[in-house]
């Protein structure tokens, strides 16, 4: 297992519709063809997996149908979007990137993006 640098923004504010987007960029040491991206959430010293996708370079990221994440890739950048967020989902969202193929295997973990989600106050049919 070899280490790899992963960069992501420090802070992101979710929209009023509970959508947060951020870029996860990795410094690929070689010509990887298969990449796995995992989003982890750290809150109250607990780390949980939010979503994960494996993709072939040049192709779209494919998350599970019921995933709260969507994403696109461009070179060594992955544009991640998380939806359905509410105030209780505020936390540190960590981007983990694995270069699966060809060998050698590389692993990179970002410092995390603090996503803030604010519950709106009552107003006609606002998004919560």
């Amino acid at each position: 297992c070899k280490a790899m640098h992963v960069a992501q923004p420090a802070v992101v504010l979710a929209s009023s519709r509970g959508i947060a987007s951020f870029v996860c960029e990795y410094a690929s040491p070689g010509k990887a063809t298969e990449v796995r991206v995992t989003v982890l959430r750290q809150a109250d010293s607990q780390v949980t997996e939010v979503c994960a996708a494996t993709y072939m370079m040049g192709n779209e990221l494919t998350f599970l149908d019921d995933s709260i994440c969507t994403g696109t890739s461009s070179g060594n950048q992955v544009n991640l979007t998380i939806q359905g967020l509410r105030a209780m989902d505020t936390g540190l969202y960590i981007c983990k990137v694995e270069l699966m193929y060809p060998p050698p295997y590389y692993l990179g973990i970002g410092n995390g993006t603090q996503i803030y989600v604010i519950d709106p106050e009552p107003c006609p049919d606002s998004d919560f």
């Epitope: 519709r17 949980t48 939010v50 359905g84 509410r86 519950d119």
Partner: antibody, heavy 123, light 107 residues
Framework: QVQLVQSGAEVQKPGASVKVSCKAS????????MHWVRQAPGQGLEWMGI????????NYAQKFLGRVTMTRDTSTSTVYMELSGLRSEDTAVYYC????????????????WGQGTLVTVSS | DIQLTQSPSSLSASVGDRVTITCRVS??????LNWYRQKPGDVPELLIY???NFQSGVPSRFSGSGSGTDFTLTISSLQPEDVATYYC?????????FGQGTKLEIK
Amino acid sequence: QVQLVQSGAEVQKPGASVKVSCKASGYTFTSYYMHWVRQAPGQGLEWMGIINPSGGSSNYAQKFLGRVTMTRDTSTSTVYMELSGLRSEDTAVYYCARDPPITMVRGAPFDYWGQGTLVTVSS
Amino acid sequence: DIQLTQSPSSLSASVGDRVTITCRVSQDISSFLNWYRQKPGDVPELLIYRSSNFQSGVPSRFSGSGSGTDFTLTISSLQPEDVATYYCQRTYNAPYTFGQGTKLEIK
């Protein structure tokens, strides 16, 4: 085990207010949202609003704006739904239901419901 | 407002039949849709959440599918205890609207 226990049946006159309680136990009260849903006799389910027991913020269906207030008491793990200006069409069973954050592992929305509180509005 | 339209509004089927209920949403809600069963006189019971996830303890004959605006609840082999009204509900954000319900009876 998780339980949501609601207050008993109420009979109110038109124009009056009613306050229904929902006491939670068996889980961390402030870690789940709470919704209120009502069901008129022989009718479908109608979402009324949601409250965040942690911060106390709430959001209501447009239909109930100005008439409904949702509050919570963290010391007793209880949420309240108060509906004012009662009319006969407010006669219904009122339910509370919990809802976890989307990122909670193995968390399913609306997985536990209260037993329901029948509110009858009659002169 | 986002509208949820269930079809059919009522149906009658025989024990062992495969039953399908659909829920059409007026705008894209990704996979944020729940399905409930409410037996006569009972509290609503969560069957499926986020389109296709089984709630713990729900019989495997129930399944859900769909994404975007079109969703389906399927009962692979109808049982007598499935006599109930079934509701879909959007859970993406407020308002957490319910469909009007589908009343299922046994022939």
